[in-house]
């Protein structure tokens, strides 16, 4: 059962796993949710009746029954983890805590103009978990405007104390706001020879990399595969760090793989969701339950629905035994990973999918697409929406992309002459315009947010957000697309598609069926040569064939330029402008979304 509200002046008795320090009960709940075993917590707020050394303690708890006895205690705030809930979860915490000093290892001290600048510094520093900033009113003159960057083993403060005229806060890496590089490559036959901060068992290097990503201290990792010569180290995932933030030594070793934490790409690739099945593999751990199941998929479902289950092993049924049902072993451990991994016993193992809700919805794999052809199939571009105007008549106005459950990203130039959001309707999950009838459900638009530097499409800033009146329930036919990570600026996208209901040539009609075209990206230098009379800025991105023939056109505006990278689709561009349509040596010009990620997050995450 999902319980989101906090219980004031209430303490849960027993079930303690560990104690951490958090600046608020709300953040304690987030820490509990991300902890592999925590189901409940008790937080102690500051209070004259409470010993100051206990202020800000967040006691993480577990219980076989998923609940614990309640005791009345002033200043105690208790609650449940969000593990039991089905909604999206985020560790992003933008709150600034006034007059609180969050203790940790102070490894960097510098002058900053504001707490915001200090927070940005922390976000862009590979080691930083949180910061404390001494304001200009701080009593000690030499400490005024000092920004202390801090880290700890757990990522949470080792203590929190009251201190006048300071403010503290967390790194915004988990809000996708870091400018740090996003290195997705996994290096085969490589060992990073740096200090280990932890080790866990993992079935493959991808899981190892994802574990590294959500481990607070891990910056890179080395994984020993099941063919690794030393038997005791097979399937071992070593979580590592270094002072520089990069591996100091790389050793060539066969059957080992190494890679980096995906902290700076976590909003555009899954880091919590281990959805694969591992055949002929047994995961060992504390047994939670043994249940009969028809298949390993059914076993995974059972594990996902059992809130304490972290991973499972399924042993298929012996012929004609137990109505063809096999045994499903639901398991857990102290850190969420198997205590040992064995091969050759015929089991099929995997992980709970409960943690998938901690990943951005946009990373979910979508239907395989039909290659070739110009008409799309249903569910092929589930983030594509058709934006309709109802004035003077109801018709398709522009394309757009779902980027959040209340947000559509589109082009600013679509709203020329649109005086009110009331005349707009957003239709999602649409393949054919002819499907849109009087009773077709749509999303009303609450607000149109146009970039305040926008003047005209050709001069840039052609970007707008639509805030919907109601939230989008994600399904196979309507779900978000990932924004590119700022750390991905140097990625060369090779699989890019433009989609829309727009014209197929300069004089044409809105298409009934959603059209698609694969289009190569063009460098800005090349694009500038083709548009001598315009300034192609770094905030624009171009795409097109030298010979022309495929391009976006009238009616496609605001729609996505979607590029697939590492099996995840990213919204690389917004259809903006061009000279004619599909003309030779006249590429289409798109708004370069990566350059507006901060703007998008600022507008969509504003309270």
């Amino acid at each position: 059962e999902c319980v989101t509200q906090l219980l004031k002046d209430t303490c849960f008795e027993g079930g303690d796993i560990t104690t951490v320090f958090t600046p608020s009960a709300k953040y304690c709940q987030v820490v509990c949710t991300y902890h592999p075993r925590c189901l409940l917590f008790t937080f102690t707020a500051e209070s004259p009746s409470e010993d100051p050394t206990r202020w800000f303690t967040c006691v993480l708890k577990d219980s076989v029954t998923e609940t614990l006895p309640r005791v009345n205690r002033t200043a105690a705030i208790s609650g449940y983890s969000f593990k039991q809930c089905s909604h999206q979860i985020s560790a992003c915490n933008k709150d600034i805590y006034v007059d609180l000093d969050m203790k940790g290892i102070n490894y960097n001290s510098s002058v900053a103009k504001s707490a915001q600048e200090c927070q940005e510094r922390c976000t862009d520093d590979v080691h930083c978990h949180f910061f404390t900033y001494a304001t200009r009113q701080f009593p000690s003159l030499e400490h005024r405007n000092i920004c202390l960057l801090k880290h700890t083993q757990t990522g949470t403060p080792t203590r929190i104390t009251k201190l006048d005229k300071v403010v503290s806060g967390f790194s915004l890496k988990s809000c996708a706001l870091s400018n740090l590089a996003c290195i997705r490559d996994i290096f085969p036959n490589t060992v990073f020879a740096d200090s280990n901060i932890d080790s866990v068992m993992a079935p493959d290097a991808f899981v190892c990399g994802r574990i590294c990503t959500h481990h607070p201290g891990c910056l890179f990792f080395t994984f020993f595969s099941q063919e690794w010569p030393k038997e005791s180290q097979r399937n071992l995932c070593l979580l590592k760090t270094s002072e520089s933030g990069l591996p100091s030594t790389r050793i060539k070793k066969s059957k080992a793989l190494s890679g980096f934490s995906l902290q700076s790409c976590r909003h555009s690739i899954p880091v919590f969701c281990h959805s694969s099945f591992y055949h002929d593999t047994d995961f060992l751990g504390e047994e939670l339950d043994i249940v009969a199941a028809k298949s390993h998929e059914a076993c995974q479902k059972l594990c996902t629905n059992a809130v304490r289950c972290q991973f499972f092993t399924y042993t298929p049924a012996q012929a004609s035994c137990n109505e063809g049902k096999g045994k499903c072993y639901l398991k857990l451990s102290s850190n969420g990973s198997p205590t040992k991994i064995l091969h050759g016993r015929g089991g099929i193992s995997g992980y709970t999918l409960r943690l998938c809700k901690m990943d951005n919805e946009c990373t979910t794999k979508i239907k395989p697409r039909i290659v070739g052809g110009t008409a799309s199939v249903r569910g092929e571009w589930p983030w594509q929406v058709t934006l309709h105007t109802t004035s003077p008549t109801q018709r398709h106005l522009c394309g757009g992309s779902i980027i959040g459950n209340q947000w559509i990203l589109t082009a600013a130039h679509c709203f020329y002459g649109v005086e009110s959001p009331k005349i707009l309707r957003v239709y999602s999950g649409i393949l054919n315009q002819s499907e849109i009838k009087e009773d077709t459900s749509f999303f009303g638009v609450q607000e149109i947010i146009i970039h305040d530097q926008y003047k005209m499409a050709e001069s840039g800033y052609d970007i707008a957000l639509l805030k919907l009146e109601t939230t989008v329930n994600y399904t196979d036919s309507q779900r978000p697309i990932c924004l590119p990570s700022k750390g991905d600026r140097n990625v060369i996208y090779t699989d890019c598609w433009v989609t829309g209901w727009g014209y197929r040539k300069l004089r044409d009609k809105i298409q009934n069926t959603l059209q698609k075209a694969k289009i190569p990206l063009v460098t800005n230098e090349e694009c500038q040569k083709r548009y001598r009379g315009h300034k192609i800025t770094h905030k624009m991105i171009c795409a097109g064939y030298r010979e022309g023939g495929k391009d976006a056109c009238k009616g496609d505006s605001g729609g996505p330029l979607s590029c697939k990278h590492n099996e995840v689709w990213h919204l690389v561009g917004i259809t903006s402008w061009g000279e004619g349509c599909a003309q030779r040596e006249r590429p289409g010009v798109y708004t370069n979304v990566v350059e507006y990620v901060d703007w998008i997050l600022e507008k969509t995450q504003a309270v």
């Epitope: 003077p392 008549t393 109801q394 018709r395 398709h396 002819s434 009838k437 044409d508 809105i510």
Partner: antibody, heavy 121, light 113 residues
Framework: EVQLVESGGGLVQPGRSLRLSCTAS????????MAWVRQAPTKGLEWVAS????????YYRDSVQGRFTLSRDNAKTTLYLQMDSLRSEDTATYYC??????????????WGQGTLVTVSS | QFTLTQPKSVSGSLRSTITIPCERS????????VSWYQQHLGRPPINVIY?????PSEVSDRFSGSIDTSSNSASLTITNLQMDDAADYFC????????????FGGGTKLTVL
């Protein structure tokens, strides 16, 4: 079931006026663009005029522009065509028609039974 | 303003297939959607094809529409011809660069033999 019922047709002298009405039922009238299409005896179809949902925008064929006025009353789910300065070439059966909900193209999804207008001295 | 030209009459025998063409005089046939209407004597028209090739749910799948850019014309095809298909058929399109200006073809009388 969509129903469009025209009325108001009849015999009228050239230069005089006539007002046609079309009462709609079976759909949300205020959500649709409506039109009049006419058909001269033993001749083809000819679009006359269209009006958007709230009546704020009207469209006419050139030969009736300035003589005909299209209006609607959404509360009464009724479409009107006020025809002034009638000419003999306006003689036709006048059909009330409903455009599609989504105007990504222009066509006539539903038609009424028609009302005959005869302009003759 | 363009015109849409249809043959005055077309005939076909019972259970055969017929095609009625509709040629656009200027501008590309593909620049705007073509619709088709069936009209029995003394009855109002019925929309049988819209948006080039889309069929309303209540219309028989024996009716299909297409456009051919090489001949700059649209076509209505009726397969497995029935006696009740005998009627006048009108094509209709518009100029997509002008707000509202539907244009009808002159109509084709279909006789079922």
């Amino acid at each position: 079931e969509v129903q469009l019922v025209e009325s108001g047709g009849g015999l009228v002298q050239p230069g005089r006026s006539l007002r046609l009405s079309c009462t709609a039922s079976g759909f949300t009238f205020s959500k649709y663009v409506m039109a009049w299409v006419r058909q001269a005896p033993t001749k083809g179809l000819e679009w006359v005029a269209s009006i958007n949902y709230d009546g704020s925008t009207t469209y006419y064929r050139d030969s009736v522009q300035g003589r005909f006025t299209l209006s609607r009353d959404n509360a009464k789910t009724t479409l009107y065509l006020q025809m002034d300065s009638l000419r003999s070439e306006d003689t036709a059966t006048y059909y009330c028609a409903r455009h599609p909900f989504n105007n990504f193209g222009i066509w006539f999804a539903y038609w009424g039974q028609g009302t005959l207008v005869t302009v003759s001295s | 303003q363009f015109t849409l030209t249809q043959p005055k009459s077309v005939s076909g025998s019972l259970r055969s297939t017929i095609t009625i063409p509709c040629e656009r005089s200027s501008g590309d046939i593909g620049d705007s959607y073509v619709s088709w209407y069936q009209q029995h004597l003394g009855r109002p028209p019925i929309n049988v094809i819209y948006a080039d090739d889309q069929r309303p749910s209540e219309v028989s799948d024996r009716f299909s529409g297409s456009i051919d850019t090489s001949s700059n014309s649209a076509s209505l095809t009726i397969t497995n011809l029935q006696m009740d298909d005998a009627a006048d058929y009108f094509c209709q399109s518009y100029d997509s660069n002008i707000d509202f200006n539907p244009v009808f073809g002159g109509g084709t009388k279909l006789t079922v033999l």
